[in-house]
């Protein structure tokens, strides 16, 4: 049975920058990939990007760059212009349409331990002074 994976990563240096990686593990060739956020197809998800192997890619804000990584995996860079990132608790979904398998969707979010709101504050770095 085909397997779909989603990886959500937050940039360590830029809390408002996220990257979503998605991949399809199975036979058949990918004919279309749709990335959404806020839920899957039919459950209130909002389209972020559509990637077609021949016709190219189309993306909508806050998506910054959608691209193919391999023939069966894609990445989507997201940039939040606001002060606090809404992405931390958001579900991102990738739907792969493949021939002859059909379409398969997987959703993922930032792991709870990566949520800046849940993690411990950073340890202050001591400032060394030479008197």
């Amino acid at each position: 049975t085909p397997e779909v994976w989603v990886q959500v990563q937050m940039e360590a240096t830029e809390l408002s920058s996220f990257t979503v990686h998605c991949g399809f593990l199975g036979p058949g060739s990918i004919s279309l990939v749709t990335v959404s956020w806020g839920g899957p197809d039919g459950a209130g998800g909002t389209k972020l990007a559509v990637l077609h192997p021949e016709l190219g890619t189309r993306q909508w804000a806050p998506a910054r760059q959608a691209r193919w990584e391999t023939q069966s995996s894609i990445s989507l860079a997201l940039e939040d212009s606001g002060a606090s990132s809404p992405f931390a608790n958001t579900t991102f979904c990738c739907k792969f349409a493949s021939f002859p398998e059909g379409s398969w969707e997987s959703c993922g979010s930032l792991p709870p331990s990566s949520d800046p709101g849940l993690s411990a504050p950073p340890t202050p770095v001591p400032i060394l002074r030479a008197d």
Partner: nanobody, 127 residues
């Protein structure tokens, strides 16, 4: 001990949608692989799909009959797993069960080796 409680079932017309929820409580740290199964009247329980978390990556796989109509997803922080079901057919009528699965679960094993079961929620699709 892990407790699983399903909700969201009900009566829906053919072509309609439903979202089932599975809330886990108790030993939720063991929620590394979760699955959905279903049992139609007079039939054996069958695998629908499973979701597996590994670090920042979520892996999802489905039974062949799903054919893109269902999406399994979860919220680890809230210990909840969902099954979004679209384009429902009368043959989807069944009791749907949430399950906690061993990490090496093989979908071909059907319901064997499942660690914990919920009590199930009934989905009826009318034509």
């Amino acid at each position: 001990q892990l407790q699983l409680v399903e909700s969201g079932g009900g009566l829906v017309q053919s072509g309609g949608s439903l979202r089932l929820s599975c809330a886990a409580s108790g030993r939720t740290r063991s929620m590394y692989v979760m699955g959905w199964f279903r049992q139609a009247p007079g039939k054996e329980r069958e695998f629908v799909g499973r979701i597996k978390w590994s670090g920042d990556t979520t892996y999802t796989s489905y039974a062949d009959f799903v054919k893109g109509r269902f999406t399994l997803y979860g919220n680890q922080a809230r210990n909840t797993v969902y099954l979004q079901m679209n384009s429902l057919k009368p043959e989807d009528t069944a009791v749907y069960y949430c399950a906690a699965l061993p990490s090496d679960y093989d979908y071909r094993a059907a319901s064997y080796g499942v660690d914990y079961w919920g009590k199930g929620t009934l989905v009826t699709v009318s034509s």
